[in-house]
Amino acid sequence: HTAAQDNCTCPTNKMTVCSPDGPGGRCQCRALGSGMAVDCSTLTSKCLLLKARMSAPKNARTLVRPSEHALVDNDGLYDPDCDPEGRFKARQCNQTSVCWCVNSVGVRRTDKGDLSLRCDELVRTHHILIDLRHRPTAGAFNHSDLDAELRRLFRERYRLHPKFVAAVHYEQPTIQIELRQNTSQKAAGDVDIGDAAYYFERDIKGESLFQGRGGLDLRVRGEPLQVERTLIYYLDEIPPKFSMKRLTA
């Protein structure tokens, strides 16, 4: 059984308030910011996590460089609108009535507009490429050991079904993890690749979302795998719609 039952905490999301006020006195946890109930046996959606993060602001994080081949999260933090299931609403607006469309991981995929901007559907991010550079080690990691450990990490820590980890590439010191998950492949209860990638990103930055003080401890054959740089690329099922002005900027 989990500590959530004993201490009434949420193992998978420290940005929650928990109390034994569920049915039969069971522990129930609600996300900060939104107040939405969360399932502590699995990952919380990225939208609810961003909302919780904005309700308790920290220092701004460094932004990654844009890529001409894929979307990267170039706009940084914002306070998102989430639907009743905790997913990003297709259209996001700020306090000054500037609006834009986002994909399923909350990354902007159109130019910014006004309140008349229409976002007909939430476009799914079906392919995520996580690009890492590890710190120098005595020698290169064995590729098959690294592959097995990263697959096990995503399965055990992030509860992501192994079929969604498409590939692990390694050319020292660069590691690339490919996550793929089409709309048709994702069954009820499956962890979303966008949520798994976000938890992984926060772990790598030393900002673990899991309860407890320990943080990520990742080793390959006993050798710590320490990451010094992370880039995450998002590919959508429908290509993004940016004006040429942005592409040539």
């Epitope: 943080g215 990520l216 401890d217």
Partner: nanobody
Framework: QVQLQESGGGSVQAGGSLRLSCAVS????????MGWFRQAPGKEREGVAV???????TAADSVKGRFTISRDNAKNTLSLQMTSLKPEDTAMYYC????????????????????WGQGTQVTVSS
């Protein structure tokens, strides 16, 4: 579904020995912080010993030199070898695991552990 099942508890005379075991399922024990805690009647649950994914171990001052924590990666089990037992070691002993791939931090805190066994009773008489 992660499950931890302790065994090996019992009654023993002071100065005697016991070996507790914890069978782990649904989790690779070698990839995360695992530990033993104990709770005596009317007292707070306290950390006894932990083992990190690296294999490094730490024991509480009250049991140092007497208790040894270890794990068997092949069998996915955690053990606690207890020697020179004292009456004050009498308690319910719990096996605990942190969320997969989590590190161990000191001082030991039950709040850092997600999964718990049901416990096994150890009674030491003088």
């Amino acid at each position: 579904q992660v499950q931890l099942q302790e065994s090996g508890g019992g009654s023993v005379q002071a100065g005697g020995s016991l070996r507790l075991s914890c069978a782990v399922s649904g989790l690779t024990s070698s990839t995360t912080c695992m530990g033993w805690f104990r709770q005596a009647p009317g007292k707070e649950r306290e950390g006894v010993a932990v083992i990190r994914s690296s294999g490094e171990t730490t024991a509480a001052d009250s049991v140092k030199g007497r208790f040894t924590i270890s794990r068997d990666n092949a069998k996915n089990t955690l053990s606690l070898q207890m020697t020179s037992l004292k009456p004050e070691d009498t308690a319910m002993y719990y096996c605990a695991a942190a969320w997969p791939y989590s590190g161990c931090l000191l001082p030991l805190s039950s709040g850092d552990f997600t999964y718990w066994g049901q416990g096994t009773q150890v009674t030491v008489s003088s």
